[in-house]
Interface confidence: low
């Protein structure tokens, strides 16, 4: 199946710069004088707003308003061509993409526009491909596409297991959602056997019981946010601050080097994720304790960046795992320290998960293709792709983003092996709430 949505492939052109140009809006950043207590709230709001504006500003001219394909030419500005165009071979012209055939979403120096996605059978075309926006495909009614298995639409379940009620309908991007009647916690187990299934019609509303669970969840999340603010002001904040290196005030990598359309999670998301991962205490489901936790932490409990993406989804909170923050043992640069460990990852991550992992981390298909071509040998492929990821995302390439991507892919063993390896190598240690000692 061809790539779609956020994973739309990049044309190669083999030029060094594939991200958007300077004109690509990246969202406002709080200035240094903004009180730290406001940062979390402001960041969350900005992320929501910037996500919305990214969709709104992608509006396109109607086909009849465009010049004939490949005829409209203009000169590049600072070496970049505007959305809906690509650069000519000699770098002198910007050539229009072909309507309905290819597109480009950002200011770019691509030698080719990106091919439009063609919706598979089992999908409906939500919006056609324009010169600045790829086709939007959606699963047909009654089916959905999970982020973990984007290659096909899967049939939605017809009902929930016994003792659970449906709180979410089947949508093109998610299966029905079931929660336990009593606790209101989400069901994350396997699809139940038919005889255990309690069927319900698409329109069945959530029971008052489960609604109260959701309300409690929202309240808990709000309380947690307030607690987080106070933690910011505590001694822990001083402990964490060197690691954040100005994340709260908008420091970090150059956001203009990150192609937001392909970054998952986005650069801005990572900033929020990293903050929340330090501040957010959570519960660990008993069945996951063995796999996830080699040793019981004595310090601060944390939420992983991937899990913190669901901060606004209280029902998800029950599923999240407790996470201790991995930091460089020698207080070096976290990204550079991580880079030094890449060599061994090929032995720790199953081969079949290399590409899904890199896509999850935001590499485009063509970047993966080029990385594989550049690799010195088969074993070197993952290393090359990871280096490409670091070069692309800069300081946003954190160890937690990597671990969470593995978690999302279901590669928990690989995640645990990498975590153990980072600790045993002596390059990383767990950040403790009241001690500096590394834990392994």
């Amino acid at each position: 199946m061809e790539q779609r949505g956020q994973n739309a492939p990049a044309a190669s052109g083999a030029r060094k710069r594939h991200g958007p140009g300077p004109r690509e809006a990246r969202g406002a950043r709080p200035g240094p004088r903004v009180p730290k207590t406001l940062v979390l709230v402001v960041a969350a709001v900005l992320l929501l707003v910037s996500a919305e504006s990214a969709l709104i500003t992608q509006q396109d001219l109607a086909p009849q308003q465009r010049a004939a394909p490949q005829q409209k030419r203009s000169s590049p500005s600072e070496g970049l061509c505007p959305p809906g165009h690509h650069i000519s071979e000699d770098g002198r012209d910007c050539i229009s993409c072909k309507y309905g055939q290819d597109y480009s979403t950002h200011w770019n120096d691509l030698l080719f526009c990106l091919r439009c996605t063609r919706c598979d059978s089992g999908e409906v075309e939500l919006s056609p491909c324009t010169t600045t926006r790829n086709t939007v495909c959606q699963c047909e009614e009654g089916t959905f596409r999970e982020e973990d298995s984007p290659e096909m639409c899967r049939k939605c379940r017809t009902g929930c297991p016994r003792g659970m009620v449906k709180v979410g309908d089947c949508t093109p991007w998610s299966d029905i959602e079931c929660v336990h009647k009593e606790s209101g916690t989400k069901h994350s187990g396997e699809v139940p056997a038919v005889e255990e299934t309690v069927t319900s019609s698409p329109g069945t509303p959530a029971s008052p019981c489960s609604l109260s669970g959701i309300i409690i969840g929202v309240t808990v999340a709000a309380v947690v946010l307030i607690v987080a603010v106070f933690v910011c002001k505590s001694l822990l904040w001083k402990k964490v601050l060197p690691y954040l290196k100005g994340i709260c005030s908008g420091g970090g990598g150059d956001p203009e080097r990150v192609d937001r359309s392909s970054q998952r999670p986005g650069a801005e998301d990572n900033v929020l994720n990293e903050i929340v991962s330090i501040l957010q205490p959570t519960q660990v489901p008993e069945q996951e304790m063995e796999v996830q936790e080699p040793a019981e932490p004595t310090g601060v409990n944390m939420l992983s960046p991937g899990e913190s993406e669901h901060l606004l989804e209280p029902a998800e909170a029950e599923r999240s795992q407790r996470r201790r923050l991995l930091v460089p043992a020698n207080e070096g640069d976290p990204t550079e320290t991580l880079r030094q460990c890449f060599d061994d990852f090929a032995d720790l991550v199953p081969f079949d998960s290399w590409e899904p992992l890199m896509r999850k981390l935001g590499l485009m298909d063509n970047e993966i293709k080029v990385a594989k071509a550049e690799a010195a040998g088969h074993r070197d492929t993952l290393y090359t792709m990871l280096i490409k990821w670091v070069n692309k995302t800069g300081r946003d390439a954190s160890v937690h983003t990597l671990l969470d991507a593995l978690e999302t892919l279901g590669e928990r063993l690989a995640k645990q092996k990498i975590e153990d390896h980072l600790l045993s190598s002596g390059k990383f240690m767990y950040l403790e709430g009241n001690a500096d000692s590394a834990m392994s």
């Epitope: 080719f112 594989k372 550049e374 088969h378 492929t381």
Partner: antibody
Framework: SLEESGGRLVTPGTPLTLTCTAS????????MSWVRQAPGKGLEWIGY??????STWYASWVKGRFTISKTSTTVDLKMTSLTTEDTATYFC?????????????WGPGTLVTVSS | ALVMTQTPSSTSEPVGGTVTIKCQAS??????LSWYQQTPGQPPKLLIY???SLASSVPKRFSGSRSGTQFTLTISGVQCADAATYYC?????????????FGGGTEVVVK
């Protein structure tokens, strides 16, 4: 456009280098492949080079006998230990440079005859 | 190594008929398959890439489809100009070597 050159009649064991010359585009932006076709037979992939980094991939039957390299405007196929089985028309092909593998530009081919 | 099995090796169809050529991959290659047309004395010409996408300036009577590891090239309303040999090229771009494999070819004769 692409043009292959260097094909000729050689005796078994004689080394031979074929050259693929590009005009109208920069080779360093593309994956370039070599493909051959024995008389009356099908197409056979030899290998390719990603000219941006000079990384190469080969078919296993090549077994180190063939080497692909590049300059700024050419891609070379250096052949050693030639046998009569290597008699074929050799094509070079350019990948479109998109995310997909699509060899959309081919040279006319150059004939190599290995005979004693 | 990736092996592409192409069938039939030759087929004959009257003008206006439909030609169907199949290629079976020995392993999963996703949609990384392209189709090429070659006439005698000429280099191959790209028809279809990523299993079903039509290359530029290729007539719409050519179409490609995929079902798992089986790929199909269909020529609807075949014309005299379509008389040629057709090849599929499967690509397993994860494996460094033996990543590309052509099918054996199908000769299409138009009556």
């Amino acid at each position: 456009s692409l043009e292959e050159s260097g094909g000729r009649l050689v005796t078994p064991g004689t080394p031979l280098t074929l050259t693929c010359t590009a005009s109208g585009f920069t080779i360093s932006s593309y994956h370039m492949s070599w493909v051959r076709q024995a008389p009356g037979k099908g197409l056979e992939w030899i290998g390719y080079i990603y000219a941006g980094s000079a990384s190469t991939w080969y078919a296993s039957w090549v077994k180190g006998r063939f080497t692909i390299s590049k300059t700024s405007t050419t891609v070379d196929l250096k052949m050693t230990s030639l046998t009569t089985e290597d008699t074929a028309t050799y094509f070079c092909a350019r990948d479109a440079g998109s995310s997909y593998w699509e060899f959309n530009l081919w040279g006319p081919g150059t004939l190599v005859t290995v005979s004693s | 190594a990736l092996v592409m099995t192409q069938t039939p090796s030759s087929t004959s169809e009257p003008v206006g008929g439909t030609v169907t050529i199949k290629c079976q991959a020995s392993q999963s290659i996703g949609s990384s398959l392209s189709w090429y047309q070659q006439t005698p004395g000429q280099p191959p010409k790209l028809l279809i890439y990523t299993a079903s996408s039509l290359a530029s300036s290729v007539p719409k009577r050519f179409s490609g489809s995929r079902s798992g590891t089986q790929f199909t090239l269909t020529i609807s309303g075949v014309q005299c100009a379509d008389a040629a040999t057709y090849y599929c090229l499967g690509i397993d771009d994860v494996r460094r070597d033996d990543g590309f494999a052509f099918g054996g070819g199908t000769e299409v004769v138009v009556k």
